[in-house]
Amino acid sequence: WELTILHTNDVHSRLEQTSEDSSKCVNASRCMGGVARLFTKVQQIRRAEPNVLLLDAGDQYQGTIWFTVYKGAEVAHFMNALRYDAMALGNHEFDNGVEGLIEPLLKEAKFPILSANIKAKGPLASQISGLYLPYKVLPVGDEVVGIVGYTSKETPFLSNPGTNLVFEDEITALQPEVDKLKTLNVNKIIALGHSGFEMDKLIAQKVRGVDVVVGGHSNTFLYTGNPPSKEVPAGKYPFIVTSDDGRKVPVVQAYAFGKYLGYLKIEFDERGNVISSHGNPILLNSSIPEDPSIKADINKWRIKLDNYSTQELGKTIVYLDGSSQSCRFRECNMGNLICDAMINNNLRHTDEMFWNHVSMCILNGGGIRSPIDERNNGTITWENLAAVLPFGGTFDLVQLKGSTLKKAFEHSVHRYGQSTGEFLQVGGIHVVYDLSRKPGDRVVKLDVLCTKCRVPSYDPLKMDEVYKVILPNFLANGGDGFQMIKDELLRHDSGDQDINVVSTYISKMKVIYPAVEGRIK
């Protein structure tokens, strides 16, 4: 019995087509992805093949103005229109709190939303009961397939799930649910979830009875053969894991941002064994036309976004200096504002011993592309922020050793004075440079804000200690020459859209007046 699994993950509000790098579409003839194009391809496969499932492995939420404005209603609407069969909860589905998940998505979705390792307690238990499920048995042709969901247990550190959701260990939570499916005579089981490729592989290895793993979170690109675009494969598609009980379990993921549609064909025998698995992600490029009816719907929903862009978010009573003359040479107040917003967006009081789980921010000065003049009645709009942060990036959470941070700060000033973008703006860090010293030895003082303290204060950086840092995804990926971050990071979780982080902060503060205050000397 042959099953076709179509899958997406980490779409992050890319409802419209995008450029090849998943930023705003500029030249339509070269654009990719988007739900209208996705629908064309899905329908083409549904017409051609008998047993098809369309699955999403989480993180539909967060990433463009679509989410900022529609807050998840757009996800429910267009996923319903595409007739998704199931979705796993990702960490970003909790970005607007549990209410921001329940009302726009859980109550509106016409497909099951899954996670076996999230357990509700207290008053939330009855409120959320039945709105998401540990598993769902889906009829597919003459057969039935069990889908069991999972979500990163790091979600409390990455989003805002509140105190009434417990995130359990994925493997511990999945096994009894898979066992239950087996007792229901369901012998074809897909684990669909959002914990990253390493956890996907562990689930394939450790959870008895799981036949296929469809993952997300790590934006992993897998491909067999010559890849069709710029993404470099992390392995073959599907990636085959040998389980502890001796079975070959295919593991798949489909990069991110709706650029690809994962396409996996599985042949099962009567016992539910995977006899063969093959496929590849399908690049959703302009050779695939956008579906006219979905496109028309997108255009209708788009109108509200254009109006939103010019509305006031808050006010500034000072000049927000985002000029390259400042931000690439010294501490600039736009850099301070952005870093403060980044830390504020990551306030998670999950442990009495810590005032917060992260206190530090770094931001390449070259990523700040425009100032904002306060003389326009102090008004700040989304449009203004889009000029400051035009690249559609995210502010991510990483874990780095102190020694890596020291290297990063040395790199920040290794060719100081040439107006290059690697000069770092900071938050929760005091750095002192001596530019008379030779490159690689210019950081003379590096103090960082404590987290395991009730009164935050600055302590010297320890080389062997592991620190959490918020930074742009551009830096996490080694951009502007920060190869040491990419090579040495111990953990990387993608965060919220950069503009959204700053806009939310400004809306919250109402009036802002960031200063230059001696963070960088």
């Epitope: 019995w1 057969e143 016992r271 064994n273 006899i275 063969s276």
Partner: antibody, heavy 114, light 107 residues
């Protein structure tokens, strides 16, 4: 649990035909196909052909094409193998086996003797 | 048709021995190979499917490997109940074909 139950042993004269049945249970019958395999005394296994339960599509080994016919009765989840123009070398145990031979019938002994 | 050449045709071994049986295909069969065990008077039983996946209930001392045209069944430590005849089966293309069998006997 998958189960395949075959009909009983048969003794046939050369030139006659034999029809062996295989009743399946424990799985979604229409979603799969059935293989037939023969094993002559003291010999290896030999694949005869297969039938897709849903629409009756068949595929035969060249050696048995024209002499073997596979049929299906969906209402009773039963598959049949008919072998015509029997000769002494057709004396063997005939097995039905699921799609990828994960489960087998108990075998039906067919003896061709004058 | 794809020919499956199985070797050895028989072998004598003792309990605890490591036993290796090989199947060579006349052309590339990808991963489309099963290993079956048959005891006298019984129907065959599948041990391994898709070259290396172990059927449920089959002891972990059985393992399969290989690719292209060369495939191997290994029994890491032979047990009394493992004395039987073993067959490979390719299902990469029609007609499906079996190897000639390997009879594992007590030394």
């Amino acid at each position: 649990e998958v189960q395949l139950v075959q009909s009983g042993a048969e003794v046939k004269k050369p030139g006659a035909s034999v029809k062996v049945s295989c009743k399946a249970s424990g799985y979604t019958f229409t979603a799969y196909f059935m293989n037939w395999v023969m094993q002559a005394p003291g010999q290896s296994l030999e694949w005869i052909g297969r039938i897709y339960h849903n629409n009756g599509d068949t595929f035969y080994s060249q050696k048995f094409k024209g002499r073997a016919t596979l049929t299906v009765d969906k209402s009773t989840s039963t598959v049949y193998m008919e072998l015509r123009s029997l000769r002494s070398e057709d004396t063997a145990v005939y097995y039905c086996a699921t799609s990828y031979v994960g489960d087998w019938g108990q075998g039906t002994t067919v003896t061709v003797s004058s | 048709d794809i020919q499956m050449t199985q070797s050895p045709s028989s072998l004598s071994a003792s309990v605890g021995d490591r036993v290796t049986i090989t199947c060579r295909a006349s052309q590339d069969i990808g991963d489309s190979l099963n290993w079956l065990q048959q005891k006298p008077g019984k129907a065959p039983k599948r041990l391994i499917y898709a070259t290396s996946s172990l059927d449920s209930g089959v002891p972990s001392r059985f393992s399969g490997s290989g690719s292209g045209t060369e495939y191997t069944l290994t029994i890491s430590s032979l047990q009394p109940e493992d004395f039987a005849t073993y067959y490979c089966l390719q299902y990469a293309s029609f007609p499906w074909t079996f190897g000639g069998g390997t009879k594992v006997e007590i030394k």
